[in-house]
Amino acid sequence: VPRWRQQWSGPGTTKRFPETVLARCVKYTEIHPEMRHVDCQSVWDAFKGAFISKHPCNITEEDYQPLMKLGTQTVPCNKILLWSRIKDLAHQFTQVQRDMFTLEDTLLGYLADDLTWCGEFNTSKINYQSCPDWRKDCSNNPVSVFWKTVSRRFAEAACDVVHVMLNGSRSKIFDKNSTFGSVEVHNLQPEKVQTLEAWVIHGGREDSRDLCQDPTIKELESIISKRNIQFSCKNIYRPDKFLQCVKNPEDSSCTSEI
C-alpha cells in the first residue's frame, strides 16, 4: 500500500537535486581558488540537514545556520549588485563586469539558483512530487527560508555604494513584497552603506519616460532615506546598449545616455 503523502501546490524537488548541488559546489570551488578549502560533502550534508525529516512548512533560518557558516565567503562589500524581477540581466552584467557580484555569484546562491527542494516530516526522503508554494501553502518552506536567509546575510555584508537593478516594465518597479523589498532593503547597514543606487531598466525601445519618478521608486527612496542611507536613481533606457558598453566602455557611442 503506498504511503499517504502530502500534496503541495508547488512543483516538487528538482530532479537529481543532491547530485546537482554537489556538482555545482565542486565546479564553483574549482573556479574560485579562494573557496578551494570548502569541503563540498560537508556543504551538502549541511544543506540536506536543513530540510530533511522536517515539516516543509516549519523551516527556520536556524535550520540553515550550518550551511550559512560553511558557505561563508569573502565578497568585496562595495561591489554588490542586488536585483529585483530582472535576474537574467543582472547576471549578464556581472558575467561581464567580473568584479561585481550578485547573490547568485556567491557559492550559496550559485548552489540553489533555480532549484526547488523539500522533504517530509519524520522521513529521510526528498519529496520530488510537490513542495509548498509560498502563497498557496506556507511561507516558511525550505526554498523561501533559504533565500530569505542568504539574502539577509548578503545585504548585511554590503558597504559603500550598493547597486540594485529594477525592472521598469513591471507595474511595481519597486515591490515591497519582493525579496529585495522585504529583506535586503531592511538589512543594509546604515553604518556601512553610504548610498543605494537604483538602475531602472526600461523594456520598450521608445520608452523615454523618467522611471526614477515612478511612485514606487519614490517609496523606495523614502524607505532608504529613513534608514539614513542616501539614494540615487538612473534610467537604463537601452539595456542591450548598456551591456555592450560595459563590455566595450571605450566605444564612442557609450558616452551618450544609455
Epitope: 560537508s42 550534508d45 549541511a46 540537514g49 550550518p66 560553511l70 561563508t72 565567503q73 569573502t74 555584508a157
Partner: antibody, heavy 117, light 107 residues
Framework: QVQLVQSGAEVKKPGSSVKVSCKAS????????IEWVRQAPGQGLEWMGD????????DYNEKFKGRVTITADESTSTAYMELSSLRSEDTAVYYC??????????WGQGTLVTVSS | DIQMTQSPSSLSASVGDRVTITCHAS??????LGWYQQKPGKAPKLLIY???NLHTGVPSRFSGSGSGTDFTLTISSLQPEDFATYYC?????????FGQGTKVEIK
C-alpha cells in the same frame, strides 16, 4: 603549518576591559572563521563568539552580548576579542581557534585574564 | 541553547583498555559534533570533527560515531598519553556548546 599565537596574560580591575589578540599564520586568514572560547579555572569550555575575517561576519553568544566585541585585521592576520565591564567571574583562560566543519581544528595557546581588585 | 551531556564524567582505565565516552545532545545536531582532548595547562586539541572524521595527525585508535542526538568517542587501546579530559561540542546552532567533560584517569 597552521599557528595561532595569542597575546600574554593580563591582570585587570573589575569594571575595566581587556583586549586579547590572536595572530594567525600558515593559512589564508580571510577564508576561515576564528572562534573564541573561554575556560574558567577548573571548569569546562564556553563558546563566546566568532568572526569571519574576510567578510566581517560576527556571531556572539547571547550571554556575552553587549560585553564582547570580536574584530579582525586582515593586514596583520590578527583577530581580537575585547571583553568589557569585567567582573571576577570573567577570570579565565581565553582561547582563539580556527573553525573547520563547525568544529575548531587549531587552537591558540590561551591567554590568562585575571580580574581582581 | 542545545545542552550537551557527556557520560561518564570520569572513568578509570588501564593502558590497553578500550574506552568509550558518550555525548547526548538535547536536540538533533545532525553530524555537527567535534571531540577534543585537553591536558592540564594546555589548549584543547581536536580529535574528531563531523562526528566521525579523524583530524590530521590524530592516531587511528581514536574513532567517533553517531548522528542526530547520540554520539560516541572510542579509544580502541588506551595509551599512557591518552590520560586527559575529553569534551564534545555541537556546531549545529548558536551558541556552540560543549559537554561538561570526561576525565580519563589511570586505574
Amino acid at each position: 603549518q597552521v599557528q595561532l599565537v595569542q597575546s600574554g596574560a593580563e591582570v585587570k580591575k573589575p569594571g575595566s576591559s581587556v583586549k586579547v589578540s590572536c595572530k594567525a599564520s600558515g593559512y589564508t586568514f580571510t577564508n576561515h572563521w576564528i572562534e573564541w572560547v573561554r575556560q574558567a579555572p577548573g571548569q569546562g569550555l564556553e563558546w563566546m563568539g566568532d568572526i569571519f575575517p574576510g567578510g566581517g561576519y560576527t556571531d556572539y553568544n547571547e550571554k556575552f552580548k553587549g560585553r564582547v566585541t570580536i574584530t579582525a585585521d586582515e593586514s596583520t592576520s590578527t583577530a581580537y576579542m575585547e571583553l568589557s565591564s569585567l567582573r571576577s567571574e570573567d577570570t579565565a583562560v581565553y582561547y582563539c581557534a580556527r573553525g573547520r566543519d563547525l568544529a575548531m581544528d587549531y587552537w591558540g595557546q590561551g591567554t590568562l585574564v585575571t580580574v581582581s581588585s | 541553547d542545545i545542552q550537551m551531556t557527556q557520560s561518564p564524567s570520569s572513568l578509570s582505565a588501564s593502558v590497553g583498555d578500550r574506552v568509550t565516552i558518550t555525548c547526548h545532545a538535547s536536540q538533533n545536531i545532525n553530524v555537527w559534533l567535534g571531540w577534543y582532548q585537553q591536558k592540564p595547562g594546555k589548549a584543547p586539541k581536536l580529535l574528531i570533527y563531523k562526528a566521525s572524521n579523524l583530524h590530521t595527525g590524530v592516531p587511528s585508535r581514536f574513532s567517533g560515531s553517531g548522528s542526530g542526538t547520540d554520539f560516541t568517542l572510542t579509544i580502541s587501546s588506551l595509551q599512557p598519553e591518552d590520560f586527559a579530559t575529553y569534551y564534545c561540542q555541537q556546531g549545529q546552532s548558536y551558541p556552540y556548546t560543549f559537554g561538561q567533560g570526561t576525565k580519563v584517569e589511570i586505574k
